[in-house]
């Protein structure tokens, strides 16, 4: 506990102090006090440096004094033999003696009191900034006018802090400009502008006379702006150092003015403006900018238009353009989107064809779509080559972004029929040799593909059974062979409406128009068991003269049987139509002149026997395309016969070409379309 | 018409083979399909196997896979079955039996051959 | 193979009745499945084919109906000639295979 004063004496004191003795005395006097320690007896052996007995006073780190020996007052009013004076409140006394003394010594009494120190002149730094007042135990400091004391008790600052400025425009100097501005002051000055503006801040390089910087480029005195987490400065030196105009893209701006305790010179002045906040004209590739500006400002509106093949991509939408507004803080609106190259996406598969996996699906990339070939071909020209356009679409020079479409090839078989091993009338054929062959178990009888929708057959075959079954792609008809062939669903028969329908249909004599259309449920894949027969054009290449020869299969009636399992076919050639009617009927149901002939009947056969029978009914008379000689056509139909192994008579497919051309696109599916 | 003659009934011994024979008339066997059907007595039908023409093989149901063949002769228009390590339960009525046409599975019945397996 | 479950084995039945015989497929044959009638002694005799087609000289009496796995072959009113065995069998690619038959006998 600190005491005002006290008492220390030596072991023993006035006796003679024992050997080997080490004693310490603690000090203590009350905070803002200093301790005068006097000595009024000293008598210890004495010794150089006091080595053997002395004792040791101390201050913190500092020995005051050593004392040994003895000594006497030169003062005959005062008995004080020694005396320390320190400044600060604590003090320490040690006492030591060594293991022997050579006479009698009686130690030492001393005597300490708490001192009034001056700690405005006792010590080398001045603890007040301005005015320094002492008094007992303590001192306090003081300002002159206009200053305050800063809350550390001892600097006296100006009140230059707190001003905020929030006018779109303003001044701001230094205490006192241009007088000596105040020492050790820190003023602070805040800018407070309305969102959307930076404070700009000019500086006239006159107007500025700070202290310099030190010898290590410290400024003792400095000016400090900051904005946000930007920093301008610390400035300081004669003649502003910086730019004279700061842009600090912030609306608000802190201004520090640090001075010490030395050097003052006139200070600064500044103005300040608030600027619509800029925004950079940023670099937005593949796009156009509107209005164009050298300088983008806060509350400015530009559209952004991409280039040709380039979109906006938000989401999942896709646009060509977009507005971007400058936005208080200095970035645009909208900074995330950008001018992307179209993507066109994967590209439709079409049917009957295929597309390549695209390397690239967008801008400029380029695809090409091809069909199944040889059942297959483009149809719709164009040449399949698309390239990603502007608008995100496929585009085709020729089809736009319609795509291509691949149809059958008509009248290609992809084995040619060979007349092989002799059979009476006929040959063995492969599917192959006739694709579009297609049999119907019900009654038993043939048709002919002319499309993927479409078979043509005899109007007598389907009279009876509007359903009928069929099936494509067999050289066999037994069950099993048709088990894995292609069944064909009806969806509807058209009959030509010129057949007239008869109530007993066995004795009929008119084929007059034996002709119609079975429209199928599903597409027919082609393939090589399975292609199309071309129908005929309309122009006179198309008429048949005598002689030409066509080919006829089916799975009708032969010598041996009633139905042949396999397909079988022959080459015939065309006969004037009174070839026909010069043949007896073999089992007349009416009289021989009943059975009507007319040019809607095209004559053939009667060489070597060879000839359509029973069974044959609907299947195709194939002749070859007079403009293109890989092609076949169907000139007729298998229609009726008035003997089998002589002449036939078939339907003149030619003559129906409008009423099947009709008839398909009405009736057609929007996909056909 | 078609019609299909069978050799005449067999006896014989477990682990011995039999060749049925079936001859048709009224065709020729080139244009047909012949498969063959046993009938165990009192049993129901079973299919052996086939041999088809449009593929040129032979097919043969995977019970009795090993231990069938089944040839022609086109020249004389005569199918042959033969069935090899006859066994006991290989007792049964053996038809040949001409595939039918659009749809219908069989056509001509031969008039069967009984085999009887017996020690 | 195709494993083919012929329902019921035996059927006793009367003159003039309903009658209708199941045949289930283990996958689907579409519609090639066929509907036999065996008489004792008698090679079969062919009555349905494609699952619902009357083949010609048999009594309209007879039907057949189904595709996929589930099939029926219905005797509308069973007549004395009637008695008999009746097999399915699938074919739509080999191996063949018949039902167990289904015996139908007079009550």
């Known amino acids: 506990e600190p005491t005002m004063y006290g008492e220390i004496l030596s072991p023993n004191y006035p006796q003679a102090y024992p050997s080997e003795v080490e004693k310490s005395w603690d000090i203590e006097v009350p905070e803002g006090y200093g301790i005068h320690l006097y000595f009024t007896h000293l008598d210890i052996e004495l010794s150089e440096n006091c080595a053997y007995d002395s004792v040791q006073i101390i201050s913190g780190d500092t020995e005051e004094g050593r004392l040994c020996g003895q000594r006497s007052s030169n003062n005959p009013h005062s008995p004080i033999v020694e005396e320390f004076q320190v400044p600060y409140n604590k003090l320490q006394v040690i006492f030591k003696s060594d293991f022997s003394n050579e006479e009698r010594f009686t130690g030492f009494a001393a005597y300490y009191v708490a001192t009034d120190i001056n700690e405005c002149t006792d010590f080398v730094d001045v603890p007040c900034s301005h005015f320094c007042n002492n008094f007992i135990g303590g001192y306090f400091c003081s300002c002159p006018p206009e200053y305050f004391l800063h809350d550390d008790m001892k600097n006296c600052g100006v009140n230059c802090s707190g001003d905020v400025f929030t006018a779109l425009i303003g001044e701001i100097a230094s205490p006192n400009y241009p007088k000596p501005y105040p020492e050790n002051s820190r003023c602070e000055y805040q800018i407070r502008l309305e969102k959307g503006f930076q404070v700009v801040v000019t500086l006239r390089r006159e107007d500025f006379d700070v202290e310099a910087a030190d010898s290590a480029g410290n400024c003792l005195d400095s000016l400090v702006f900051v904005a946000g987490d930007r920093q301008f400065g610390p400035y300081c030196g004669h003649g502003f150092p910086g730019p004279l105009n700061i842009e600090t893209k912030s609306n608000a701006l802190d201004i520090i003015f640090q001075t010490d305790l030395t050097g003052q010179k006139k200070g600064w002045k500044l103005r300040y403006h608030g600027d619509p906040m800029p925004c950079p004209k940023e670099d937005t590739p593949n796009s156009v900018w509107e209005p164009a500006k050298a300088k983008y400002v806060f509350r400015d509106v530009v559209q952004i238009t991409c280039l040709d093949g380039f979109e906006v991509v938000e989401g999942r939408v896709g646009a060509t353009s977009f507005y971007s507004t400058c936005q208080s803080n200095g970035k645009w609106s909208n900074s995330k989107l950008k001018c992307q190259p179209v993507d066109c996406g994967i590209p439709e598969s079409i049917e009957n064809g295929k597309v390549e996996d695209p390397e690239s699906t967008l801008f400029g990339s380029v695809i090409r779509y091809t069909c199944e070939e040889p059942y297959y071909y483009m149809e719709n020209g164009g040449g399949g080559e698309y390239h990603c356009a502007g608008n995100g679409s496929w585009v085709n020079e020729v089809l736009g972004p319609e795509l291509p479409k691949c149809v059958p090839v008509c009248g290609v078989p992809r084995e040619p029929f060979e007349e092989k091993q002799r059979i009476i009338g006929g040959s063995d054929a492969d599917i192959k040799n006739f694709p579009w062959q297609v049999f119907f178990d019900n009654p038993w009888a043939g048709g002919a593909l002319i499309n993927e929708y479409w078979v043509l057959t005899a109007a007598h075959v389907v009279e009876g059974n509007r359903e009928p079954t069929m099936y494509v792609g067999s050289t066999s008809v037994q069950t099993s062979r048709l088990a894995k062939s292609k069944m064909l669903t009806p969806e509807h028969v058209f009959i030509h409406p010129g057949w007239k329908l008869l109530e007993v249909p066995e004795g009929r004599t008119n084929f007059d128009n034996d002709i119609a259309l079975v429209r199928l449920k599903d597409p027919v894949k082609m393939g090589p068991t399975v292609s199309p027969i071309c129908l005929p054009g309309t122009s006179s290449d198309y008429n048949l003269m005598d002689g030409d020869l066509g080919l006829i299969s089916g799975w009708g009636r032969t010598e041996k049987r009633d139905r042949a399992v396999r397909l079988k076919a022959a080459r015939l050639p065309v006969a004037p139509l009174r070839k026909c009617k010069e043949v007896k009927v073999e089992k007349p149901t009416a009289d021989a002149e009943a059975y009507v002939f007319t040019p809607n009947m095209i004559c053939a056969g009667g060489e070597k026997g060879m000839d359509s029978c029973k069974g044959d009914s609907g299947g195709a008379f194939a002749v070859q395309d007079p403009n293109d000689k890989t092609k076949f056509y169907a000139a007729g139909l298998v229609s009726w016969g008035p003997q089998c192994g002589t002449y036939g008579l078939y339907t003149r497919v030619k003559n129906y070409v409008d009423w099947i051309m009709k008839t398909m696109q009405e009736n057609s599916t929007p996909r056909e379309d | 018409q078609v019609q299909l003659v069978q050799s005449g009934a067999e006896v014989k011994k477990p682990g011995a083979s039999v060749k049925v024979s079936c001859k048709v008339s009224?065709?020729?066997?080139?244009?047909?399909?012949m498969h063959w059907v046993r009938q165990a007595p009192g049993k129901g039908l079973e299919w052996m196997g086939t041999f088809d023409p449009e593929e040129g093989e032979t097919i043969y149901a995977q019970k009795f896979q090993g231990r069938v063949t089944m040839t022609e002769d086109t020249s004389t228009d005569t199918a042959y079955m033969e069935l090899s390590s006859l066994r006991s339960e290989d007792t049964a009525v053996y038809y040949c039996v001409t595939e039918g046409e659009a749809g219908r599975p069989f056509d001509a019945w031969g008039q069967g051959t009984l085999v009887t397996v017996s020690s | 193979d195709i494993q083919m479950t012929q329902s019921p084995s035996t059927l006793s039945a009367s003159v003039g009745d309903r009658v209708t015989i199941t045949c289930r497929a283990s996958?689907?044959?579409?519609?090639?499945l066929a509907w036999y009638q065996q008489k004792p002694g008698k090679a079969p005799k062919l009555l349905i084919y494609?699952?619902?087609s009357l083949e010609s000289g048999v009594p309209s009496r007879f039907s057949g109906s189904g595709s996929g796995t589930e099939f029926t072959l219905t005797i509308s009113s069973l007549q004395p000639d009637d008695f008999a065995t009746y097999y399915c069998?699938?074919?739509?690619?080999?191996?063949?295979?018949f039902g167990q038959g289904t015996k139908v006998e007079i009550k």
């Open positions: 069998v699938q074919y739509p690619s080999y191996s063949w295979t």
């Open positions: 996958q689907s044959i579409s519609s090639w």
């Open positions: 009224g065709d020729t066997l080139t244009e047909l399909s």
């Open positions: 494609k699952a619902s």
